[in-house]
């Protein structure tokens, strides 16, 4: 689970445990339950009243090369009459994500590990008024 | 794996693909520092499809600590502050990477593990299914 | 630099309540998880609860459920835990300490707010 | 809940000494043990975490071991200003709990 920082890295570990040079992990990049489907609701991004659109981040040298990132379609929610409300917000909800850097240095590569924060879709909220004195 | 674009003055015995076992540096970057992120928020309370939030805990697992959503009813919230049934409240998931130790236990070895969450909730028009 | 200010020693009557709180200072308040624990002499260091204030969202050690309620405000940067029917066994001091959830430790505590429960 | 044993409850030192605590869990909490001291009046301070690191600005006479349910925290050449009560805690899985203290007093 948790990650020490480089050094003092001794462990009185299980003998199966493989070795690993201080400072580094050893990271399979094969993925557990790589073919898993998110069994979303059909459609929220377009049913919902705060709506959104996907875009595809691609990055070579990051691992997933591909991160979807969602916007929010309105800054109000829509009602039921279809309208935008301008009196409600649509908002964008976010969740940190881990990926595997790449990194040239001069012919060598190097693996760094790097929270993403990705917009998974948006809600819609009640507008925090601020009264001016 | 995938590509990678290579140095042309490095030799060529570099592999184009990304392997698949490396060793990463212990040090998390960051990549949200400069941003803004509004996952600080209320949202949770001020939603017209509320969530309630969850610490699910896995000592095996990098990060140990997730806070997952759950919707808190089947409606939404209307303007009067009342469940409405003819809206749905569903949850937002994401598929998302995280690191299990592999094999178990073993504190610097991991291996990419892809977990689904529910992050939020969104409100919704139901899908109405005509009987026949 | 990181600092947790907690409010100051409470004499308060057995079946009150009282409010404690932590400030936090040199880093973004919503960042991190707040978690409460409590010293006595008899039952030394016991985990309370967490509070993250970023979600809102909270999660207790089940002996403390029906003790303590932990809420936060991000405006003022303070974590709150409301202690009810206090009885002589809450006396105590408590701390707030701020956890780490990527790397899983607690780095930085509260000086403690001392509570005593006595008529 | 995880429990945790440490021993022992007082230690009888002088300057200069090397002094060993041991904490033992109920069940295995990997490397997911942190070591505090604690001086009269303030709150704990970490020194170790994840059973064998040291914390920013701690100095390399306390180090601390272990794998599993058995943890050592070592003070190498003790100084004055080490005398504390010194605590072991799990955040294996929550509750988190702590160790019952070592107290380190002057012989």
């Known amino acids: 689970r948790k990650i020490p920082k480089v050094g003092h890295t001794f462990f009185q570990k299980p003998e199966s445990c493989p070795p690993v040079p201080g400072g580094s992990m050893k990271l399979d990049i094969g993925i557990i339950n790589e073919n898993q489907r998110v069994s979303m609701s059909r459609n929220i991004e377009s049913r919902s009243t705060s709506p959104w659109n996907y875009t595809v981040t691609w990055d070579p040298n990051r691992y997933p090369s591909e991160v979807v990132q969602a916007q929010c379609r309105n800054l109000g929610c829509i009602n039921a009459q279809g309208k935008e409300d301008i009196s409600m917000n649509s908002v964008p909800i976010q969740q940190e994500t881990l990926v595997v850097r790449r990194k040239h240095q001069g012919c060598s590569v190097s693996f760094q590990l790097e929270k993403v924060l990705v917009t998974v879709g948006c809600t819609c909220v009640t507008p925090v008024i601020h009264h001016v004195q | 794996g995938i590509t990678i674009p290579r140095n042309p003055g490095c030799p060529n015995s570099e592999d184009k693909n990304f392997p698949r076992t490396v060793m990463v540096n212990l040090n998390i970057h960051n990549r949200n520092t400069n941003t803004n992120p509004k996952r600080s928020s209320d949202y949770y309370n001020r939603s017209t499809s509320p969530w309630n939030l969850h610490r699910n805990e896995d000592p095996e697992r990098y990060p140990s600590v997730i806070w997952e959503a759950k919707c808190r009813h089947l409606g939404c919230i209307n303007a009067d502050g009342n469940v409405d049934y003819h809206m749905n409240s569903v949850p937002i998931q994401q598929e998302i990477l995280v690191l299990r130790r592999e094999p178990p236990h073993c504190p610097n070895s991991f291996r990419l593990e892809k977990i689904l969450v529910s992050v939020g909730c969104t409100c919704v028009t139901p899908i109405v299914h005509h009987v026949a | 630099q990181v600092q947790l200010q907690q409010s100051g020693a409470e004499l308060v009557r057995p079946g009150a309540s009282v409010k404690l709180s932590c400030k936090a200072l040199?880093?973004?308040?919503?960042?991190?998880?707040f978690h409460w624990v409590k010293q006595t002499p008899v039952h030394g260091l016991e985990w309370i609860g967490v509070?993250?204030?970023?979600?809102?969202?909270?999660a207790y050690n089940q002996n403390f459920r029906d003790k303590a309620t932990l809420t936060a405000d991000k405006s003022s940067s303070t974590a709150y835990m409301e202690l009810s029917s206090l009885t002589s066994e809450d006396s105590g001091v408590y701390y707030c300490?701020?956890?780490?959830?990527?790397?899983?430790?607690?780095?930085?505590w509260g000086q403690g707010t001392a509570l005593t429960v006595s008529s | 809940n995880i429990v945790m044993t440490q021993t022992p409850k007082f230690l009888l030192v002088s300057p200069g000494d090397r002094v060993t605590i041991t904490c033992k869990a109920s069940?295995?909490?990997?490397?997911?043990v942190g070591w505090f001291q604690q001086k009269p009046g303030q709150s704990p301070k970490l020194l170790i975490y994840?059973?064998?690191n040291r914390y920013t600005g701690v100095p390399d006479r306390f180090t601390g071991s272990g794998y599993g349910t058995d943890f050592t925290f070592t003070v190498n050449t003790v100084q004055a200003e080490d005398l504390a009560v010194y605590f072991c805690?799990?955040?294996?899985?929550?509750?988190?709990?702590f160790g019952g203290g070592t107290k380190l007093e002057l012989k």
């Open positions: 300490t701020r956890f780490l959830t990527y790397e899983g430790y607690f780095d930085y």
């Open positions: 040199g880093y973004t308040f919503t960042d991190y998880e």
């Open positions: 509070i993250h204030p970023g979600n809102g969202g909270t």
């Open positions: 069940q295995s909490v990997s490397i997911d």
């Open positions: 994840h059973a064998s």
């Open positions: 805690q799990q955040d294996y899985s929550s509750p988190y709990t």
